[in-house]
Amino acid sequence: DAHKSEVAHRFKDLGEENFKALVLIAFAQYLQQCPFEDHVKLVNEVTEFAKTCVADESAENCDKSLHTLFGDKLCTVATLRETYGEMADCCAKQEPERNECFLQHKDDNPNLPRLVRPEVDVMCTAFHDNEETFLKKYLYEIARRHPYFYAPELLFFAKRYKAAFTECCQAADKAACLLPKLDELRDEGKASSAKQRLKCASLQKFGERAFKAWAVARLSQRFPKAEFAEVSKLVTDLTKVHTECCHGDLLECADDRADLAKYICENQDSISSKLKECCEKPLLEKSHCIAEVENDEMPADLPSLAADFVESKDVCKNYAEAKDVFLGMFLYEYARRHPDYSVVLLLRLAKTYETTLEKCCAAADPHECYAKVFDEFKPLVEEPQNLIKQNCELFEQLGEYKFQNALLVRYTKKVPQVSTPTLVEVSRNLGKVGSKCCKHPEAKRMPCAEDYLSVVLNQLCVLHEKTPVSDRVTKCCTESLVNRRPCFSALEVDETYVPKEFNAETFTFHADICTLSEKERQIKKQTALVELVKHKPKATKEQLKAVMDDFAAFVEKCCKADDKETCFAEEGKKLVAASQAALGL
């Protein structure tokens, strides 16, 4: 329904607090280098303008689109050219090209300093001195580092962030109360950002059809009692929400997400029996809860799919009449019967079915041609099952850190051209699949593991896209969204790679390593491991293990020494020489 003033419409729907927060997120996600104060100023100007439009929708400029209003505002930033370079050229364009241009300049790996957590007392003082500014700064810092963070979900994180400070800054032991909560929010936030990044990549790189297929499969697993028409409606609405958020239309996205939550709760009887608790919560919690809700129980009696999708004489007729609807029904029926499969596996099965029908429905005897289509599914199902079994066994044998190291070596040998920080980050995250998923019973392992791996490999893909260095990575990332993981799994050692020149500086360590947290120390060691493999890609597991054991002993020894810096200098030289000898460098 058309509104005279879009900005007034969204301001009224969302309320001032959410409106301001979402505009701040939008601006910070576009102009990731701008100082906080500049963004606050821009947001206040937009908010004051929105209020004039609420008072009189016919007022000057109130009829302009949100993209026009926000783009014009962003283009008033004086330092645009010197801070952002060619992004300033976006301002010469008209809408909608200008917004597309801004979107293309979003940086998944912005050159921003690491967020350092101040002392708890310092944070609590800042929180009490100016709660509003403190929370805005949280939104700003997260949004600029995660330019695709799901905006309405970031509002939920901010609400939890505020609740943590409100509770813990009054506690007897502030740190004991606050720090675990902040750790949890940080870890959940990173996971939420990565999951949303995959949704946006799916929409932007593979199109709406790919996202809708993903959504049909996931919602059918989650709501197996819902009718196909109901699932289709939810998929359409969900696609609109994510298209808007991924496109920078955060006000519309948040508004539509609230409408979707309202619809789901009003119709929960025909959707899922698991929604009751979610639907009693306030809006932000409700939307989050619905997004995370457990799968409903399967209907008591579901027949074999063979009758409708293989044995029926009308298969080709039904397929020809409405291809995507028929394939959607196939995916819905398959997914609701298989909560034990990953979404990407279900999509591979649907793709195989589609390919078979494309071929067979043009054949002389279609039925004879597609009669054994489900036999083709067997290897597709068994491949991830076997892979997960093998890797969970390896994880249980090695523990998380050494399992990550095994993956570091594996992936560095596959794609040694990728930057070391990216290989470390991605392999560490791949390795977390063990503690995240291997504890689950078999029926939950595959959806946990393979769908998580899709999220992590997408991180590799978006980071690599910024600075492409490997044709193999590009190929696996762009050919097929659902086959990314099998594509990377199938990669062998890159025989074309010319080993990196040995540089002693890479393996020179200082006493500062002793004061690092365990996690940061692991990252240092894992960085060295990647560099070793880049120098000697053909090194055996045993050789690498020996060098890494020596390295661990060296760090431990020097961190206990009285003169740490001298120890690192002298013992470091010996370690480098011994490592070179061990690896035949």
């Epitope: 008591a300 579901l302 074999s304 019967r337 489900f374 599914f377 067997k378 199902v381």
Partner: nanobody
């Protein structure tokens, strides 16, 4: 964990009947699609029949349609295969299987638990 034990196999003349039973222990079978498969000497295991969780739907291989009937009694935690008009080509080791999730009923990879099998020999 579900343990499955088949019984009721034996030697029977062509045209005769047998009733196979599959008793489950360790878990209730009402959450599982139950299926029967068979393997003749030197051949691959093949699907025979399957039945949905509450028994509302059944599914048969073309070769046994109209001669075999699958049924289940969830209160007794048992599935059955009534085999009539038996033929020499029905001679095989018959396996009972339970699958928590199944889209196709006929695909062995969708079944989680298997019995040891009971031998059926059809011979004059």
């Amino acid at each position: 964990e579900v343990q499955l034990v088949e019984s009721g196999g034996g030697v029977v003349q062509p045209g005769g009947s047998l009733r196979l039973s599959c008793a489950a222990s360790g878990s209730t079978i009402s959450s599982y699609v139950m299926g029967w498969f068979r393997q003749a000497p030197g051949k691959e295991r093949e699907f025979v029949a399957a039945i949905s969780r509450s028994g509302g739907y059944t599914y048969y291989a073309d070769s046994v349609k109209g001669r075999f009937t699958i049924s289940r009694d969830n209160s007794k935690n048992t599935a059955y295969l009534q085999m009539n008009s038996l033929r020499p080509e029905d001679t095989a080791l018959y396996y009972c299987a339970a699958g928590r999730y199944s889209a196709w009923y006929s695909q062995s990879y969708e079944y989680d638990y298997w019995g040891q099998g009971t031998l059926v020999t059809v011979s004059s």
